[in-house]
């Protein structure tokens, strides 16, 4: 780091390599929780209008497809991989696309996805086709 | 290679505005996202604002949107920050800083092209 910028003690805001270069924060959709109209589709659009720097270099995208009886809501946030959310782990942190996985949650249908490339949470991906290891 | 100075910085009331300049030497500029990164005393790094090279989609940390407007003029090889409504919490010093292209965007800060930063302070 240099010398005229200081490092502050146990600063989560200042997260380096291993050769101590500073990493650049992701950049997410970041709309919190709205109604959708994505259903049984392959692919969705978040059709969220907001860019966010996320606040923390470590924090990666996510998004959360919710149905109940009475609605679907799709949530776009940043968050860090190192912490639970929703109760889950984010397992698919470091993939560059949104691959929605189903997770069990009572009294709704639960899907949620994390991933590392800028604005990945954008375009959200139910397909089986991705689930397997896709290189894309 | 692009190297950055920082200037506009300086004291001004809670509620004024300042414009940030960043000046870049090199002829890559063009190539680069661009970003406004500050630091508060005793702080660590806050990421501000960025800006895309083509196009100049801009994007901005929720503490500041609203107030702050990042823009740059590739043929001066110079990115601003307009800062208006400023608060007692946005004294820092500010620096600019290049992203790298690449396939994705690197995610590492090239800390051989840091400038000095200029210091804003809002205070009564």
């Known amino acids: 780091i240099p010398p005229h910028v200081q490092k502050s003690v146990n600063n989560d805001m200042m997260v380096t390599d291993n050769n101590g270069a500073v990493k650049f924060p992701q950049l997410c959709k970041f709309c919190d929780v709205r109604f959708s109209t994505c259903d049984n589709q392959k692919s969705c659009l978040s059709n969220c209008s907001i860019t966010s720097i996320c606040e923390k270099p470590q924090e990666v995208c996510v998004a959360v497809w919710r149905k109940n009886d009475e609605n679907i809501t799709l949530e776009t946030v940043c968050h860090d991989p190192k912490l639970p959310y929703h109760d889950f782990i984010l397992e698919d942190a470091a993939s560059p696309k949104c691959i929605m996985k189903e997770k069990k949650k009572p009294g709704e249908t639960f899907f949620m996805c994390s991933c590392s490339s800028d604005e990945c949470n954008d375009n959200i991906i139910f397909s089986e086709e991705y689930n397997t290891s896709n290189p894309d | 290679e692009v190297q950055l100075l920082e200037s506009g910085g300086g004291l001004v009331q809670p509620g004024g505005s300042l414009r940030l300049s960043c000046a870049a030497s090199g002829s890559t500029f063009t190539e680069y996202r661009m970003w406004w990164v500050r630091q508060a005393p005793g702080k660590g790094l806050e990421w501000v604002s960025?800006?895309?090279?083509?196009?100049?989609?801009?994007y901005y940390a929720d503490s500041v949107r609203g107030r702050f407007t990042i823009s740059r003029d590739n043929s001066k090889n110079t990115l601003y920050l307009q800062m208006n409504s400023l608060r007692a919490e946005d004294t820092a010093v500010y620096y600019c800083a290049k992203q790298a292209p690449g396939e994705k965007w690197a995610r590492r800060w090239d800390l051989d092209y840091w400038g000095q930063g200029t210091l804003v302070t809002v205070s009564s």
């Open positions: 960025a800006i895309e090279p083509i196009g100049h989609r801009t």
